[in-house]
């Protein structure tokens, strides 16, 4: 997360006293992991299995349709962001199992933990793009008929990815491996050394651009969309409302612990008790944020079953119907069922 937020449980009793006791050996290792770390490992394992398989399936389903179907372009990009993040999980899993020891080298330390941040920014920016698309479909249907095309969608996605990469750079640059003298261990973390102000700036930017600003804009955006669509008799559905709210909320719910602890740690001294307490929860917060990487396919399936009643259909077929159904822009005052349903499908990421 921020500075070197890893504790060293292997040599549990080696540094809890200030008197010499030459009869007590101090370098005997204990193999017990902390409860938050065990929970993190369980979450990582589930996220990896569901995330890799689910997102691979979504990529496979949407890739064929992405040339012509705009919704497929959105979901393809979201799935790619999630899939990439999931690929880093075995490494992060191994590191936690080894009490946060990082034997994978400096390059892996810079790249792999940065993937979850890239995912966060890519997802929220893609979510913002999708939300803008939903908004325009509802409030500017004529404009959409004239200009809403696959080319523009791909450009919007490219811009989102570019900005996400740009926002990930600070964490990438400050991420280094540190080898501790005792217990002998290599740690991977972010080191700002003398620059506490820069550390705080990065944490604040991450909180604002990756959380607070999107939360505000998406809340406003979806409030307007839901008010408009819900006021139409043809689209008045509590299911729609529930799914859209759940879909938008998931991003913020799962990122909240990471963001809160991140901002707190940037303002705390690394030797303070609160910092050390948050430290112990770091892996759990990261794993909780990682749930975003596997939640999308689950929501697509649940939404697909709930709206279209396609319980008897195969999973790829169900996903294809959910993810590639094109929003039809009518000049009439209400949307087609297809539009509302598609809008309700995870129009958010991670």
């Amino acid at each position: 997360m921020n500075s070197f937020n890893y504790t060293t449980p292997d040599y549990g009793h080696y540094d809890d006293k200030d008197t010499l006791d030459l009869n007590t050996p101090v370098d005997k290792t204990s193999n017990t992991l902390r409860v938050p770390d065990i929970l993190a490992l369980v979450i990582f394992a589930v996220v990896f299995l569901v995330g890799v398989l689910g997102n691979a399936l979504v990529v496979w389903v949407t890739a064929f349709e992405a040339k012509r179907t705009i919704n497929a372009i959105w979901f393809l990009n979201l799935a790619v962001a999630d899939f990439l993040s999931c690929l880093a999980l075995p490494i992060l899993f191994t590191s936690i199992v080894q009490h946060h020891h990082w034997p994978f080298g400096g390059a892996a330390c810079s790249i792999l933990p940065s993937l979850i941040l890239l995912n966060m920014y890519a997802s929220i920016l893609l979510l913002a793009t999708i939300s803008a698309d939903r908004f325009l479909l509802v409030f500017k249907p004529i404009w959409c008929q004239n200009f809403r095309g696959a080319g523009l969608a791909w450009i919007a996605c490219a811009v989102a990815w570019g900005l996400a990469l740009l926002l990930t750079i600070p964490s990438f640059l400050y991420r280094v491996v540190r080898e501790e003298y005792f217990p002998p261990k290599v740690l991977c973390g972010v080191d700002y050394s003398h620059d506490k102000r820069r550390e705080r700036a990065v944490a604040i930017v991450r909180l604002v651009l990756g959380f607070l600003w999107p939360l505000l804009t998406l809340t406003i955006c979806y409030t307007f969309i839901l008010l408009r669509t819900w006021s139409r008799r043809a689209t008045r559905s509590t299911k729609t409302l529930k799914v859209v709210v759940a879909v938008v909320a998931s991003f913020f719910i799962f990122w909240l612990p990471y963001q809160v602890t991140g901002i707190m740690m940037s303002f705390l001294e690394p030797s303070s008790p609160t910092f050390l307490l948050l430290n112990k929860l770091d892996s759990l917060c990261v794993s909780f944020a990682y749930i975003n990487c596997c939640i999308n396919p689950i929501i697509y399936v649940v939404a697909g079953q709930g709206f279209q009643g396609r319980l008897r259909k195969s999973l790829p077929s169900l996903l294809r119907n959910v993810l590639t159904e094109e929003s039809v822009v009518r000049e009439s005052k209400s949307f087609t069922r297809s539009t509302v349903d598609t809008m309700a499908q995870k129009t958010q990421a991670v």
Epitope: S3, D15, P25, D27, H100, Y181, F182, S193
Partner: antibody, heavy 119, light 112 residues
Framework: QVQLKQSGPGLVAPSQSLSITCTVS????????VDWVRQSPGKGLEWLGV???????KYNSALKSRLSISKDNSKSQVFLKMNSLQTDDTAMYYC?????????????WGQGTLVTVSA | DVVMTQTPLSLPVSLGNQASISCRSS???????????LHWYLQKPGQSPKLLIY???NRFSGVPDRFSGSGSGTDFTLKISRVEAEDLGIYFC?????????FGGGTKLEIK
């Protein structure tokens, strides 16, 4: 009472190897690590490496290829071996122990072995 | 490697006066367990270094209370409240948080 006593040659010819023995008393080598540090007028105090209680060694990366630390727990002895010595390896060589590891820094030091590399 | 920079190089002081030595590290020295492994040593001519202060501010056994250490993160200070003749020698700061442990260049405390 904790003590570290060093023994080894004072004069080494260039390209030859150096061997120093550190005999400890007052604690067990199976439980505690012993470090080697050298001090030269040009480089000041320089950490060479450590051998932990479980026998794991760690070396200063700049000297890793020429350095070897081993021990004999039963004799309470730790050995430093350094190959291919050059004139800039001329220094006072110390064995030291933190006992409670980095808790206390290097709390106990040997008396030092002055090594001169000269033809 | 962590570079330890000590200032001043030489510190002339009158007996009974206070002396202050600074040490700055190129990286934060906070260990992942929350401790900071920054130590101070005194080396008198012809002797091995002796540990004075461990973990920033803890006095090692037998060290008089006129010696005190302070600091955090990357900036540390050793203070001698009333310098005595036996305090003269070279003072080193050192870190053992990261591999390799590194030492400062030393500060020579001498009579003014």
């Amino acid at each position: 009472q904790v003590q570290l006593k060093q023994s080894g040659p004072g004069l080494v010819a260039p390209s030859q190897s150096l061997s120093i023995t550190c005999t400890v008393s007052g604690f067990s080598l199976t439980n505690y690590g012993v470090d080697w540090v050298r001090q030269s007028p040009g480089k000041g105090l320089e950490w060479l490496g450590v051998i932990w209680g479980d026998g794991i060694t760690k070396y200063n990366s700049a000297l890793k290829s020429r350095l070897s630390i081993s021990k004999d727990n039963s004799k309470s002895q730790v050995f430093l071996k350094m190959n291919s010595l050059q004139t800039d390896d001329t220094a006072m060589y110390y064995c030291a122990s933190a006992l409670d590891y980095s808790n206390y820094g290097f709390a106990y030091w040997g008396q030092g072995t002055l090594v001169t590399v000269s033809a | 490697d962590v570079v330890m920079t000590q200032t001043p190089l030489s510190l002339p002081v009158s007996l009974g006066n206070q002396a202050s030595i600074s040490c700055r590290s190129s990286q934060r020295l906070v260990h992942s367990n929350g401790n900071t492994y920054l130590h101070w040593y005194l080396q008198k001519p012809g002797q091995s270094p002796k540990l004075l202060i461990y973990k920033v501010f803890n006095r090692f056994s037998g060290v008089p209370d006129r010696f005190s250490g302070s600091g955090s993160g990357t900036d540390f200070t050793l203070k001698i409240s009333r310098v005595e003749a036996e305090d003269l020698g070279i003072y080193f700061c050192a870190q053992s948080t990261l591999v390799p442990p590194t030492f400062g260049g030393g500060t020579k405390l001498e009579i003014k």
